[in-house]
Interface confidence: low
């Protein structure tokens, strides 16, 4: 594949990554799939600086990120280590709440209205953010 050196149209470049911010809502799995089809992944937040950047662009709206615990432990979709990595949960979160009555707990993480993170039911139709790194080998040519 080719090496991506600039961001696709309608994507925002920041610190050698490209970000795409949805304006509609999807369930977490559908959002994850959308990003993969764009040769990207749901956003992986690795620093307070990146957190502030994403927060600035999404505003006070529930928005999926690439963090889930559907198979047990919390995992970032790109393999970034969760335990040692950046975290920005709301104080009482994650709580894997079952009280919503929708079946199961809460296995997918999202940005809340104040930017801090919450775990929620993965089927909820939230906005999402895709991220792809510049200078990585892509399977497809850039979308120009």
């Amino acid at each position: 594949g080719s090496e991506r050196t600039c961001c696709p149209v309608n994507w925002v470049e920041h610190e050698r990554s490209c970000y795409w911010f949805s304006r509609s809502g999807k369930a977490w799995a559908d959002a994850d799939n959308y990003c993969r089809l764009e040769d990207a992944h749901l956003v992986v937040v690795t620093s307070w600086e990146e957190q502030k950047f994403v927060q600035h662009h999404i505003g006070p709206v529930n928005t999926w990120m690439g963090l889930h615990d559907q198979n047990g432990p919390w995992k970032w979709v790109d393999g970034t280590d969760y335990e040692t990595g950046f975290k920005n949960w709301r104080p009482e979160q994650p709580d894997d709440w079952y009280g919503h009555g929708l079946g199961g707990g809460e296995d997918c993480a999202h940005f809340t209205d104040d930017g801090r993170w919450n775990d929620d039911v993965c089927q909820r139709p939230y906005r999402w953010v895709c991220e792809t790194e510049l200078d990585k080998a892509s399977q497809e040519p850039p979308l120009l």
Partner: antibody, heavy 114, light 107 residues
Framework: EVQLLESGGGLVQPGGSLRLSCAAS????????MSWVRQAPGKGLEWVST????????YYADSVKGRFTISRDNSKKTLYLQMNSLRAEDTAVYFC???????WGQGTLVTVSS | DIQMTQAPSSLSASVGDRVTITCRAS??????LVWFQQKPGKAPKSLIF???SLQSGVPSQFSGSGSGTDFTLTISILQPEDFATYYC?????????FGPGTKVDFK
């Protein structure tokens, strides 16, 4: 400042109806589940109903199911409780609360009596 | 439905005392428990959420512990403004339920 302000309480006859409102300010209303909790005079707290942030999911206590309807207007940042077929045992102060009780209104008194 | 019980139902204490209130759920509720304080004629106020996390702005003499079915609220050094009724509340599953309350009054 984060605030909830209830209104709409009053005296109503058994079998009558009343609609309570809860006006929210100081936070992104649509991001939070909202609940109604009531407290009969001299008694403890009783959960009544909860509605999801979008308004798409609602839950009710068995004691009010089929008689009360919770709703919200996110554009007006307002929560509602429509109470029909009121009974004497519905007499209470009704509080609206955000999320899991992190913010409460001051309450509004509903008295059901002939 | 999940039943919540509290002990004691009331207690008399003095300023400076250490006060402990227990709450028991009829089934496992993980850490999905809140403690509220209520004074006469006022709305409840959240003290502790997720069983052990202190609500913002609440003084540090309040602490919570427990998980599963057994929970404790501790006031390490009772202050004059702490005389009130305390309720536990489970939000693990609907219908949400409250404990019957514990009234803390002057000895």
């Amino acid at each position: 400042e984060v605030q909830l302000l209830e209104s709409g309480g009053g005296l109503v006859q058994p079998g009558g109806s009343l609609r309570l409102s809860c006006a929210a300010s100081g936070f992104t209303f649509s991001s939070y589940d909202m609940s109604w909790v009531r407290q009969a005079p001299g008694k403890g707290l009783e959960w009544v109903s909860t509605i999801s942030g979008s308004g798409g999911i609602t839950y009710y206590a068995d004691s009010v199911k089929g008689r009360f309807t919770i709703s919200r207007d996110n554009s007006k940042k307002t929560l509602y409780l429509q109470m029909n077929s009121l009974r004497a045992e519905d007499t209470a102060v009704y509080f609206c609360a955000r999320d899991r009780g992190s913010v409460w209104g001051q309450g509004t008194l509903v008295t059901v009596s002939s | 439905d999940i039943q919540m019980t509290q002990a004691p139902s009331s207690l008399s204490a003095s300023v400076g005392d250490r006060v402990t209130i227990t709450c028991r759920a009829s089934q496992d509720i993980s850490n999905h428990l809140v403690w509220f304080q209520q004074k006469p004629g006022k709305a409840p106020k959240s003290l502790i959420f997720a069983a052990s996390s202190l609500q913002s702005g609440v003084p540090s003499q309040f602490s919570g512990s427990g998980s599963g079915t057994d929970f404790t609220l501790t006031i390490s050094i009772l202050q004059p403004e702490d005389f009130a009724t305390y309720y536990c509340h489970q939000y693990n599953s609907y219908p949400f339920t409250f404990g019957p309350g514990t009234k803390v009054d002057f000895k």
